[in-house]
């Protein structure tokens, strides 16, 4: 198959490779305080860390990218750490007609990979 | 809505922001010459370039990431340029039972965004 085996152990040392990390943010940080009422603080899971060769490759394209980056680092960037899935979050916010609860499916990362 | 308007004009100058670029690669480059027979050369579209604030944001999460990167650049990375969609590619390759044509859906990028 076109898939080499993606690596799951980090060759750079603990916590250095692509992983999920929690970042605390207030509505003010996000610039949402004028329209979101609740929650006032968000625990935002984000994808951080490096993507060494074949670490958590998202797909065949990411494996190719990793290989070509090794050959042409100035021309082809290394894969980077982005969400592979998301966790839904419900926000309470102002609308034209009052106040509403709405679920956002693409706000908080649940998993990460190298793409 | 949680979506600020993603920017589509590059503030860094032409060709600097996240875009699709063609990279020529041989089967040797990819390490595939022992099992792929054709094509011998691939025109690989890849996503390259920077992701300045709100440029081609993939979703709400990417917009949040851009904003928090501005506030905490050491803790939160900037969004990065990754494929938003792929173009299928047919490879002719050796199998245990002979030669086969197989479609790969995740090999060549068709569009890019900042995630």
């Amino acid at each position: 198959s076109a898939h080499a085996h993606p690596r799951d152990s980090c060759p750079l040392g603990p916590g250095r490779c692509c992983h999920l990390e929690t970042v605390q943010a207030t509505l003010e940080d996000l610039g949402w305080s004028d329209w979101v009422l609740s929650p006032r603080q968000l625990q935002l899971s984000m994808c951080v860390g490096e993507c060494p060769h074949l670490y958590r490759s998202a797909n065949t394209h990411a494996q190719i990218k990793a290989r070509l980056h090794g050959l042409q680092p100035d021309k082809v960037p290394a894969p980077c750490c982005v969400p592979s899935s998301y966790t839904p979050v419900v926000l309470m916010h102002r609308t034209d007609s009052g106040v509403s609860l709405q679920t956002y499916d693409d706000l908080v990362a649940r998993g990460c990979h190298c793409a | 809505s949680a979506h600020a308007h993603p920017r589509d004009s590059c503030p860094l100058g032409p060709g600097r922001c996240c875009h699709l670029e063609t990279v020529q690669a041989t089967l040797e480059d990819l390490g595939w010459s022992d099992w792929v027979l054709s094509p011998r050369q691939l025109q690989l579209s890849m996503c390259v370039g920077e992701c300045p604030h709100l440029y081609r944001s993939a979703n709400t999460h990417a917009q949040i990431k851009a904003r928090l990167h501005g506030l905490q650049p050491d803790k939160v990375p900037a969004p990065c340029c990754v494929p938003s969609s792929y173009t299928p590619v047919v490879l002719m390759h050796r199998t245990d039972s002979g030669v086969s044509l197989q479609t790969y859906d995740d090999l060549v990028a068709r569009g890019c965004h900042c995630a």
């Epitope: 609740s38 006032r40 899971s45 839904p88 419900v90 309470m92 106040v99 509403s100 609860l101 679920t103 | -």
Partner: antibody
Framework: QVQLVQSGAEVKKPGASVKVSCKAS????????IIWVRQAPGQGLEWMGW????????VYAQKLQGRVTMTTDTSTSTAYMELRSLRSDDTAVYYC??????????????WGQGTLVTVSS | DIQMTQSPSSVSASVGDRVTITCRAS??????LAWYQQKPGKAPKLLIY???SLQSGVPSRFSGSGSGTDFTLTISSLQPEDFATYYC?????????FGGGTKVEIK
Amino acid sequence: QVQLVQSGAEVKKPGASVKVSCKASGYTFASYDIIWVRQAPGQGLEWMGWISALSGDTVYAQKLQGRVTMTTDTSTSTAYMELRSLRSDDTAVYYCARTRHDTSGIRFDYWGQGTLVTVSS
Amino acid sequence: DIQMTQSPSSVSASVGDRVTITCRASQGIDSWLAWYQQKPGKAPKLLIYAASSLQSGVPSRFSGSGSGTDFTLTISSLQPEDFATYYCQQVHSFPITFGGGTKVEIK
């Protein structure tokens, strides 16, 4: 520890108003919103509305719109629910509850002991 | 409004029994569902939130599952203090709505 203490039982005549208080302690009042829920004798739970303790924004159940007003006083960490033009079917135990809302979702984690409001001529 | 339908409306069980209560939403509510326990003359007590997260201090014999429209509360081994009425509640959209309740009685 977190506590919500409600005002005492009330007996009201039809057409009158009632104002129930809910005094919070053991946490930062403005950091958590308050909901009100009522329960008629032998019946289930009915959500009445939500108030933001920080901004004062409110959401009311449609059937109570125009008769109910929810307010907060952050200086005394107290929430109030006033119901006007009382009818016999407003006879119920009225509860306040603290809203916990984060990225895991919404839940009502601490409740007052309840206030019985009886509407009778 | 989202209607929440609980079943059964009552169940007779013995100490040690496994009890399952179901709750169905009239439209999809993701995982935005909570379960509460209420004893006579007392305020409701939160057991489960976000469909399956156990509230702090609640015994692990209580568990919740489901997403979308169908949800379940399970008491793995009924204890004497578990005889009460249980309510599901959706917090997906306003107005917030409760199920009609399930009374767990001693057999």
